[in-house]
Interface confidence: low
């Protein structure tokens, strides 16, 4: 596990789990018929969803200097999405198919976040918006958007861990 003060997480383990997350996130992507996405630009990316941005220290130099900034950002995002996947948006009607990868995705988000959580140290988690869609079609639409956003997030996280495993592992 990562601990405060700059020691590293299990980069290789994180890399493997983040690659699994990428696969699960793509396989969980639902097909939703009532969205017309001609071109989904940055303007449609929420302020509320955690993003990995330039100032987060996830670039090679930032990871070398102090990986904790980047890891904290990734941790926030993992917890954010883990909460969303465990919410009524995904547990409510219409029910997910029994073989849906969302359950595995949910568990893997939690697993990776635990690898990153410093022992004996609490990282602030980002509050998730209060979402209570009343209609099944609203839930379907939200699932689509959340999974799309999650795919982008875990893709960046996987690149971070791949770099860490290749260059920062002891």
């Amino acid at each position: 596990r990562a601990v405060p003060g700059g020691s590293s997480p299990a980069w290789t383990q994180c890399q493997q789990l983040s690659q699994k997350l990428c696969t699960l996130a793509w396989s969980a992507h639902p097909l939703v018929g009532h969205m017309d996405l001609r071109e989904e630009g940055d303007e449609e990316t929420t302020n509320d969803v955690p993003h990995i941005q330039c100032g987060d220290g996830c670039d090679p130099q930032g990871l070398r200097d102090n990986s904790q900034f980047c890891l904290q950002r990734i941790h926030q995002g993992l917890i954010f999405y883990e909460k969303l996947l465990g919410s009524d948006i995904f547990t409510g009607e219409p029910s997910l198919l029994p073989d849906s990868p969302v359950g595995q995705l949910h568990a893997s988000l939690l697993g990776l976040s635990q690898l990153l959580q410093p022992e004996g140290h609490h990282w602030e988690t980002q509050q998730i918006p209060s979402l209570s869609p009343s209609q099944p079609w609203q839930r379907l639409l939200l699932r689509f958007k959340i999974l799309r956003s999650l795919q982008a997030f875990v893709a960046v996280a996987a690149r971070v861990f791949a770099h860490g495993a290749a260059t920062l592992s002891p």
Epitope: L37, E39, G41, E43, D48, P129, L131, P133, Q138
Partner: nanobody
Framework: EVQLVESGGGLVQAGGSLRLSCAAS????????MGWFRQAPGKEREFVAR????????YYADSVKGRFTISRDNAKNTVYLQMNSLKPEDTAVYYC?????????????????????WGQGTQVTVSS
């Protein structure tokens, strides 16, 4: 504060078309996502369609997909809802609304409470 004024409603036969307009005064709409909602008698206000600031991303309610088209002309500070193949169940008061954020925010655009400015509405009646 922005003022929104809808127009273009009326009485139309089933299968007909109407084009609603939502004109804004007070400030430019170009930085904001805009939505159309409707409220039938005795029912809750429901989401119809939404368009992002540049018009690059559009969302529709399942019930209107393929029949309604939302668009915007930022130069004219106006948002439109083209309604084709109208059905009696489309009868409602139609409202346009401004999302206070230009960003997609979780489920915010689906929920009427997330919009901060509303027009007075325009009545659409579809007879069979």
């Amino acid at each position: 504060e922005v003022q929104l004024v809808e127009s273009g409603g009326g009485l139309v036969q089933a299968g007909g078309s109407l084009r609603l307009s939502c004109a804004a005064s007070g400030r430019t709409l170009s930085s904001y996502s805009m939505g159309w909602f409707r409220q039938a008698p005795g029912k809750e206000r429901e989401f119809v369609a939404r368009i992002s600031p540049s018009g690059s991303a559009i969302y529709y309610a399942d019930s209107v997909k393929g029949r309604f088209t939302i668009s915007r002309d930022n130069a004219k500070n106006t948002v439109y809802l083209q309604m084709n193949s109208l059905k009696p169940e489309d009868t409602a008061v139609y409202y346009c609304a401004k999302d206070p954020s230009p960003y997609y925010r979780g489920s915010a655009y689906l929920l009427s409470g997330s919009y901060d400015s509303w027009g007075q509405g325009t009545q659409v009646t579809v007879s069979s």
